[in-house]
Interface confidence: medium
């Protein structure tokens, strides 16, 4: 399965939208920064394409879930959020098409499940942090910056997958 070139462009647009969503200065929130333990090893180059597609899918699905909550709607600009949802939805479709074609179904299912679980736990930590911080503007800003970071890392993985073909 070949991810379309538009998928890569969509990833960049998603990052741009996340950048535009910023409302306050992260420098006023340094004390609120938190290490969420992004499971970078689950996105390492050692994985085959078959193993990474479902993990990338889970990553984007979790971002979609995080930003489509009521609390998120109250925190961000509605127009930008709508564009953000559209980009994520398109990327999910691209990745789902690959899964349907059989990529990611055959090899090392246990390793794949572990990776997906690690991504879910990562987002659980983010959700818990937001709850503990009572969804404050600084908490959302810290999370937005973290999602930019982790999404950027997963985008780099997609690019490396493309270049290996």
């Amino acid at each position: 399965c070949d991810l379309p070139q538009t998928h890569s462009l969509g990833s960049r647009r998603t990052l741009m939208l996340l950048a535009q969503m910023r409302r306050i200065s992260l420098f006023s929130c340094l004390k609120d920064r938190h290490d969420f333990g992004f499971p970078q090893e689950e996105f390492g180059n050692q994985f085959q394409k078959a193993e990474t597609i479902p993990v990338l899918h889970e990553m984007i699905q979790q971002i979609f879930n995080l930003f489509s909550t009521k609390d998120s709607s109250a925190a961000w600009d509605e127009t930008l959020l709508d564009k953000f949802y559209t980009e994520l939805y398109q990327q999910l479709n691209d990745l789902e098409a690959c899964v349907i074609q059989g990529v990611g179904v055959t090899e090392t299912p246990l390793m794949k499940e572990d990776s997906i679980l690690a991504v879910r736990k990562y987002f659980q930590r983010i959700t818990l942090y937001l709850k503990e911080k009572k969804y404050s503007p600084c908490a959302w800003e810290v999370v937005r910056a973290e999602i930019m970071r982790s999404f950027s890392l997963s985008t780099n993985l997609q690019e490396s997958l493309r270049s290996k073909e």
């Epitope: 992260l26 910056a145 973290e146």
Partner: antibody, heavy 118, light 107 residues
Framework: QVQLVQSGAEVKKPGASVKVSCKAS????????IHWVRQAPGQGLEWMGW????????GYAQKFQGRVTMTRDTSTSTVYMELSSLRSEDTAVYYC???????????WGQGTLVTVSS | DIQMTQSPSSLSASVGDRVTITCRAS??????LNWYQQKPGKAPKLLIY???SLQSGVPSRFSGSGSGTDFTLTISSLQPEDFATYYC?????????FGQGTKVEIK
Amino acid sequence: QVQLVQSGAEVKKPGASVKVSCKASGYTFSGYYIHWVRQAPGQGLEWMGWMDSNSGGTGYAQKFQGRVTMTRDTSTSTVYMELSSLRSEDTAVYYCAKEVFSGWYDYWGQGTLVTVSS
Amino acid sequence: DIQMTQSPSSLSASVGDRVTITCRASQSISSYLNWYQQKPGKAPKLLIYAASSLQSGVPSRFSGSGSGTDFTLTISSLQPEDFATYYCQQSYSTPYTFGQGTKVEIK
């Protein structure tokens, strides 16, 4: 592609001011911070401060407080760093750098040499 | 301000050698530690951010580790283009501060 293009070298007299520009292109200007870092000849890197390209907010290192001013022009995606009351110790290469996220810089300008000499 | 101390300040090594540079912070900085490479007359280049994350496009022979106060940059097999000066930088709190640099020279 992302680029940060800085203004040319300057020679100034002690007590004068210098204004260095940094023109950004290839990314969403308002989405990121620009930081300034300087390097005296044969020395290490020294952080000067940051500029929020979106709001215009700034933060300066205590050492430069009162002498440095960072501004931006969103219409041209340009950030400026002005340093006043120059002394010979301010002779350095001044870099602007785009902050990715939590304080790391993925793109740097080519540097601007400011020489302070009587 | 947080002080960053790098060691050694310079080292001589040969192509193919494994090189390790350490950086110590005067207080805990979690994993807010970044590594840069600088060649003469050029701007610094980001190698590693957040202590252990490899910047896109940087060869995998570069790796970073550590958290809290002690950090390490490792070049697993030194290449001719790796002879340069390396700086660590903390981004835990402002003012962000850099180590004094480690110059890697040809033996």
